[in-house]
């Protein structure tokens, strides 16, 4: 008789999830010499241990502590790029500006990027059928708690000028409910961080508005200022040109405002 299985509103665990995590770990540790000491089997065991046999609506940050410990990594604290709703461009940027890091350029972020996972209470099975949706089911699900945990730690590590890339095409350029707005902003350490620098990325070719004056950006400035951190903002009117000029600042097309 088939066992009754909880049906959640979100997509199930990414197919070949264990193999994917293990393969990503091996690849990452091969490419990054400072992480060569990491035992990827132990990493997978700790990852699995965070959610297997646990109710997928009852996951805590504590569940992920063994994984966090194994994935401890030092990135230059003044070279951190946060992002909100504009992941692809942020990743393109750090692929060119190799000394800057998004969360997904760290081991733990790289392992989990774009993946979904959850287990079931009291069984060692991974649920490939469905996983809890943050809104429709519960917020303390394995994926959400993972990203909340690693995002908090990443923000806590930042120093000097912290950069954040924001999507100027969204109705809420700064969204208080995003991971950036709900976790990272509140975990920057004022004794280490002097300034939060926002880059507002324009979508439209002819969009010459100053989106740094957007009400949601002013809201972000207010939150940051209250935390005793300075705030600055820059419009990136031509993201394609911006990337090109990061690659080669001496290029003749880089002689005008970006």
């Amino acid at each position: 008789v088939p066992r009754w299985r909880q049906q959640w509103s979100g997509p199930g665990t990414t197919k070949r999830f264990p193999e994917t995590v293990l393969a990503r770990c091996v690849k990452y540790t091969e490419i990054h010499p400072e992480m060569r000491h990491v035992d990827c089997q132990s990493v997978w065991d700790a990852f699995k241990g965070a959610f297997i046999s646990k109710h997928p609506c009852n996951i805590t940050e504590e569940d992920y502590q063994p994984l966090m410990k194994l994935g401890t990594q030092t990135v230059p604290c003044n070279k951190i790029l946060l992002w909100s709703r504009i992941k692809d461009l942020a990743h393109q940027f750090t692929q060119v500006q190799r000394d800057m890091f998004t969360l997904e350029d760290t081991l733990l972020g790289y392992l989990a990027d774009d993946l979904t996972w959850c287990g079931e209470f009291n069984t060692s099975k991974i649920n490939y059928q469905s996983c809890p949706d943050w809104r429709k089911d519960c917020s303390n699900n394995p994926v959400s708690v993972f990203w909340k945990t690693v995002s908090r730690r990443f923000a806590e590590a930042a120093c000097d000028v912290v950069h954040v890339m924001l999507n100027g095409s969204r109705s809420k350029i700064f969204d208080k409910n995003s991971t950036f707005g709900s976790v990272e902003v509140h975990n920057l350490q004022p004794e280490k961080v002097q300034t939060l620098e926002a880059w507002v990325i324009h979508g439209g070719r002819e969009d010459s508005r100053d989106l740094c004056q957007d009400p949601t950006i002013k809201e972000l400035e207010s939150i940051i200022s209250k935390r005793n951190i300075q705030f600055s903002c820059k419009n990136i009117y031509r993201p394609d040109k911006f990337l090109q000029c990061v690659k080669n600042p001496e290029d003749s097309s880089c002689t005008s405002e970006i």
């Epitope: 800057m100 000097d160 000028v161 002097q194 300034t195 880059w199 300075q230 903002c233």
Partner: nanobody, 122 residues
């Protein structure tokens, strides 16, 4: 190529003020982070302050509250306003530029001026 020229250095009494200027030419100034470094007699070159292309500022702990960095993109110039000067601020002050992002490490700046001498003495 970015060319940088500092000015404004001179002899000043302890407790006095000074404004250094650094004029840039050759590239789009507004796309560059600008910084001030200094090198005292027999000392290593050290970071003083920086301002990014987005006007983010960054200061060394020893100058916080005394020095202010600012930029005027229309004039292609970066300034260092120095108040409450102390004898230990005596050094050659250098202006430096790098693409976009403000950092502390001198090795990460591609372009440098020749420097201007600041002497704080009574």
């Amino acid at each position: 190529q970015v060319k940088l020229q500092e000015s404004g250095g001179r002899l000043v009494q302890p407790g006095g003020s000074l404004r250094l200027s650094c004029a840039a030419s050759g590239r789009t100034f507004s796309n560059y982070a600008m910084a001030w470094f200094r090198q005292g007699p027999g000392k290593e070159r050290e970071f003083v302050a920086a301002i990014s292309a987005a006007d983010s500022t960054l200061y060394a702990d020893f100058v916080k509250g005394r020095f202010t960095i600012s930029r005027d993109n229309a004039k292609n110039t970066v300034y260092l306003q120095m108040n409450s000067l102390k004898p230990e601020d005596t050094a050659v002050y250098y202006c430096a530029a790098r693409w976009w992002i403000a950092v502390r490490a001198p090795a990460e700046y591609n372009y440098w001026g020749q420097g201007t001498q600041v002497t704080v003495s009574s």
